[in-house]
């Protein structure tokens, strides 16, 4: 007789956690190597048993120590003989147990007295599965067929909910869902003015607890004194928890405070934070920049700049910048309206300009003055002669703001 895998199709039902032995009877072959297949995939299982019934008749077992839902499926065995594969009739394995949850109630945050829903679903086998709802330790609904939706009209405090699934094998309890009450957010903290200019201020803050409802926006209120008239109120979507305040008055004292809102309403304001905008840089350039040749070098003079208004504040030192054709350049600060320039190369053209500074920065540069090398060579006259040979060049002259120290000898500026 040829190779035969004996047995009719079988439906086998076992309880979850129980051991299972699926058997496969092989006739017509000595000591077969039996392979087990589940749902089309070879079962890699070293836990196989064999019983020799006779020399040409063997029974193989697939041993499952503890059946689980994932073991359920269609099994068969197969044996190779002479390059051909014989396949047995299938065994349909069903694993029954207490219900298994596919959907469990989730934690929620809701406004007081607002309606909400919770969902629960469990499956067998065995079916049917029924659902019972619990609110804390009180049964509140059911039994109802799975899946089940619990409609709650509202709660006034944090409340626990769970569901229980029943079938012929017993019951299973879901996770406990906590329904939290939403509340107004807490006040922001760490309110900081991160960047200041004469007319703008950048503000950043940390949000307080959101009251279990998404923060939707924050309001930045600005006054010229704590509790004074509101100058500005900016509503910003969040995150990020930052805001740029624009169009502020220079050199002015302000205070700001921040609050944030969720769907239920706004938080309290954070404490007032004082700040002061910077003043304006000087608006005017020094006028009438001119030069006088001396034996020791070159004297540069210009007219004093008078502040145009209180926002400029007191005007401080002057900044003098010069550059030569050979690339040598320098910047220096001088207190008055006169500087003695020495150490420059008279064989090269010289460009000089000056600005006045205050606490904010330097104002506009004066018109550049150019000293030509041939002018130096040809100039005669007594020391401190007020004859000027410096001629303003057009505004297309180089504007150097940065410091650059070259290997050339640096000229000296003396008051």
């Amino acid at each position: 007789a040829g190779l035969k895998l004996m047995g009719a199709p079988v439906k086998l039902t076992v309880s979850q956690g129980q051991p299972v032995k699926l058997n496969c009877s092989v006739e017509g072959m000595e000591e077969p190597d039996i392979q087990w297949v589940k749902d089309g995939a070879v079962v890699q299982n070293l836990d196989q048993l064999y019983i020799p019934v006779s020399e040409q008749h063997w029974i193989g077992f697939l041993s499952l120590k503890s059946a689980e839902r994932s073991d359920a499926g269609r099994y068969w065995c197969q044996v190779e003989d002479g390059g051909e594969t014989e396949i047995s009739q299938p065994v349909w394995l069903t694993v029954e147990g207490v219900p298994f949850f596919t959907v469990e109630p989730k934690d929620l945050a809701v406004p007081p007295n607002a309606p909400f829903q919770l969902s629960c679903e469990a499956v067998g086998p065995p079916e049917p599965v029924t659902i019972v709802w619990w609110r804390g330790t009180t049964k509140i609904g059911g039994p109802a067929p799975s899946p089940s939706v619990l409609n709650v009209t509202g709660v006034t405090q944090s409340t626990m909910f769970s569901c229980e699934a029943h079938n012929l094998k017993g019951l299973a309890s879901s996770r406990t869902a906590t329904v939290h009450l939403q509340a107004l957010p807490a006040a922001p903290f760490n309110v900081t003015v991160t960047k200041l200019s004469s007319s703008n201020a950048s503000v950043a803050w940390m949000p307080g607890a959101d009251g279990r409802a998404l923060l939707q926006s924050c309001t930045v209120q600005v006054t010229q004194a704590p509790g004074g008239w509101e100058v500005l109120a900016v509503v910003v979507p969040v995150p990020p928890f930052t805001c740029l305040l624009r169009d502020l008055v220079p050199a002015t004292n302000y205070s700001l405070r921040v609050r944030c809102a969720n769907a239920l309403g706004p938080s309290p304001y954070a404490d007032w934070v004082p700040f002061q905008t910077k003043g304006l840089a000087p608006a005017s350039a020094p006028q009438n920049l001119h030069a006088i040749r001396t034996d020791s070098g070159l004297i540069l003079e210009w007219e004093e700049v008078i502040p145009e208004g209180p926002l400029e504040g007191p005007l401080g030192p002057y900044k003098l910048s010069w550059v030569q054709d050979n690339g040598t350049q320098d910047e220096l600060t001088v207190e008055g309206t006169r500087a003695n320039l020495t150490g420059w190369d008279p064989q090269k053209d010289l460009i000089v300009r000056v600005c006045v500074s205050n606490a904010v920065g330097c104002g506009p540069w004066s018109q550049p003055l150019v000293v030509s090398s041939h002018d130096h060579a040809g100039q005669q006259g007594p020391p401190h002669s007020r004859t000027s040979w410096l001629v303003p060049r057009g505004s297309s002259a180089h504007h150097h703001h940065h410091h650059h120290h070259s290997a050339w000898s640096h000229p000296q500026f003396e008051k």
Partner: antibody, heavy 125, light 108 residues
């Protein structure tokens, strides 16, 4: 009486190939499986792999997959463990085991009742 | 790769009960086997399929399994029980075997 006779101790250099053997007697060779177990000096047991009764199915432990080959010759009732390129870390005692024992529930492959005396393999330069 | 974890050593006085544990994630689904190895000898099967005693093994040896833990119990340990004990099981996928690291039982 079931007997598993293993080949003698061997000393090899790293990179060398080696095959050790395990000859079974006292039972029908194709009624049972053969497993190989390694034990490094002063260390624990390590399951290397198993070959089915007909040699059609082999299983290997993850540490040994691709490094060793298990085979069997039914005509001589002999199982083999082969290395293509030995490493110093292969120095160990190698046991062949008859996998499968008769119990009231049937023949259990993982019932390791009969062990060979072991083959000591030393790999040193 | 799959691992079985055993305590490195257990000490008892003669006549006391020795318990050796073995933990592995697949033990709820896969059987545990216990092997005894005395110094210089090949291992000997003591317990198979969690709790069944192998032939020729004294009744003081018993096995149990619960969840991810298998336990070998020697009730009234004797000096001759001093040995290394290894648990053995199969990987979660069922495609390779694994020994635990071994437990040295000392009977003082």
């Amino acid at each position: 009486e079931v007997q598993l006779v293993q080949s003698g101790a061997d000393v090899k250099k790293p990179g060398a190939s080696l095959t050790i053997s395990c000859q079974a007697s006292g039972y029908t060779f194709t009624d049972y499986w053969i497993s190989w177990v390694r034990q490094k000096p002063g260390k624990g047991l390590e399951w290397m792999g198993r070959i089915s009764r007909h040699g059609s199915q082999t299983y290997y432990g993850p540490s040994f997959q691709g490094h060793v080959t298990i085979s069997a010759d039914r005509s001589t009732a002999t199982a083999y463990l082969q290395w293509r390129s030995l490493e110093a870390s292969d120095t160990a005692m190698y046991y062949c085991v008859r996998a499968g024992g008769q119990t009231s529930g049937g023949t259990i492959p993982e019932y390791y009742q009969h062990w060979g005396p072991g083959t000591l393999v030393t790999v040193s330069s | 790769s799959y691992e079985l974890t055993q305590p490195p050593s257990v000490s008892v006085s003669p006549g006391q009960t020795a318990r050796i544990t073995c933990s592995g994630d697949a033990l709820p689904k896969k059987y545990a086997y216990w092997y005894q190895q005395k110094s210089g000898q090949a291992p000997v099967l003591v317990i198979y399929e969690d709790h069944k005693r192998a032939s020729g093994i004294p009744e003081r040896f018993s096995g149990s399994s619960s969840g991810t833990m298998a336990t070998l119990t020697i009730s009234g340990a004797q000096v001759e029980d001093e040995a290394d004990y290894y648990c053995y099981s199969i990987s979660p996928a069922g495609n390779y075997g694994v020994f635990g690291g071994g437990t040295k039982l000392t009977v003082l």
